[in-house]
Interface confidence: medium
Amino acid sequence: MMTGTIETTGNISAKKGGSVILQCHLSSTMAQVTQVNWEQHDHSLLAIRNAELGWHIYPAFKDRVAPGPGLGLTLQSLTMNDTGEYFCTYHTYPDGTYRGRIFLEVLESSVAEHSARFQIP
């Protein structure tokens, strides 16, 4: 039985050219996290953090994605095209898969305030 819940940074905004941290947290379960996948809305993989093997950043994103903090992901040099949904998929044993959603809005404005709060989607 899957008892866990994913908390995410929810809806966040950041300015063009800046960076943003995508963060998910799995709670309320004793399941072992074996892998975390970070994906874009089109299912393309940005990065994998495997418990045995560490981080792998996919080649298309190597220049603009940094692993961490923790199991999170840092997107750098943001462009307007980065606006959209991001998903963290927690592969756990024995529970199975937990999935969290984050919506990132990249703003042109230089006064765009980086807003992030943890929430349960």
Epitope: T34, E39, L45, I48, E52, L53, T92, P94
Partner: antibody, heavy 125, light 107 residues
Framework: QLQLQESGPGLVKPSETLSLTCTVS??????????LAWIRQPPGKGLEWIGS???????YYNPSLESRVTISVDTSKNQFSLKLSSVTAADTAVYYC?????????????????WGQGTTVTVSS | EIVMTQSPATLSVSPGERATLSCRAS??????LAWYQQKPGQAPRLLIY???TRATGIPARFSGSGSGTEFTLTISSLQSEDFAVYYC?????????FGGGTKVEIK
């Protein structure tokens, strides 16, 4: 290129323990960034994942078999093993050892890309 | 666990024709899906991983598509050696699960 070879008795009595070994050649388990797995196929049926192990000894089992399964790895012999206890006729199958992610630099969960040829195990008195 | 359902169970096709095999996951597996080919008396062979990437040495007539819960394996022009059973498998969470298989037979 890694190659796999299963070995073990072809006949096991009901209630006994099935024991199989998979020998890996062409590369060292101790340095491999992949998962070692056991998969079975009952006669005329589909494939069923039994469980997987990483070189560190971390194991992952199919919940339907977990209470009866033990998978272990011996890096010094370049082998990994399957033990399935309290077998019944329903455990009669071709048992395959396989490697998940052997040919991928993009590590993580990918696919079973290398398979042994399989060994038939019959449970009968 | 994620249940993988394949259809049809049997597909009768003439050599040279196109074959389309379907696989459905009971919940999203993103692009974490593999396809295998198995011939009688042989171990399965990996054809496609990450839903659409051909494994090394697999001919271009094999192609995979789909993401989320719906996936397709297409064999553009069936050769005699392609008549076999095809399995899909999700590579996303534990436990690993396979579909029941589609047998592609000669019409």
């Amino acid at each position: 290129q890694l190659q796999l070879q299963e070995s073990g008795p072809g006949l096991v009595k009901p209630s006994e323990t099935l024991s199989l070994t998979c020998t890996v050649s062409g590369g060292s388990i101790s340095s491999g960034s992949y998962y070692l797995a056991w998969i079975r196929q009952p006669p005329g049926k589909g494939l069923e994942w039994i469980g997987s192990i990483f070189r560190s000894g971390s194991t992952y089992y199919n919940p339907s078999l977990e209470s009866r399964v033990t998978i272990s790895v011996d890096t010094s012999k370049n082998q990994f093993s399957l033990k399935l206890s309290s077998v019944t006729a329903a455990d009669t199958a071709v048992y395959y050892c396989a490697i998940e992610g052997a040919n991928f630099k993009d590590f993580g969960y990918v696919a079973f890309d290398i398979w042994g040829q399989g060994t038939t195990v019959t449970v009968s008195s | 666990e994620i249940v993988m359902t394949q259809s049809p169970a049997t597909l009768s096709v003439s050599p040279g024709e196109r074959a389309t095999l379907s696989c459905r996951a009971s919940k999203s597996v993103s692009s974490n899906l593999a396809w295998y080919q198995q011939k009688p008396g042989q171990a399965p062979r990996l054809l496609i991983y990450f839903a659409s990437t051909r494994a090394t040495g697999i001919p271009a007539r094999f192609s995979g598509s789909g993401s989320g819960t719906e996936f397709t394996l297409t064999i553009s022009s069936l050769q005699s050696e392609d008549f076999a059973v095809y399995y899909c498998q999700q590579t996303s969470p534990w436990p690993r699960t396979f579909g029941g298989g589609t047998k592609v037979e000669i019409k």
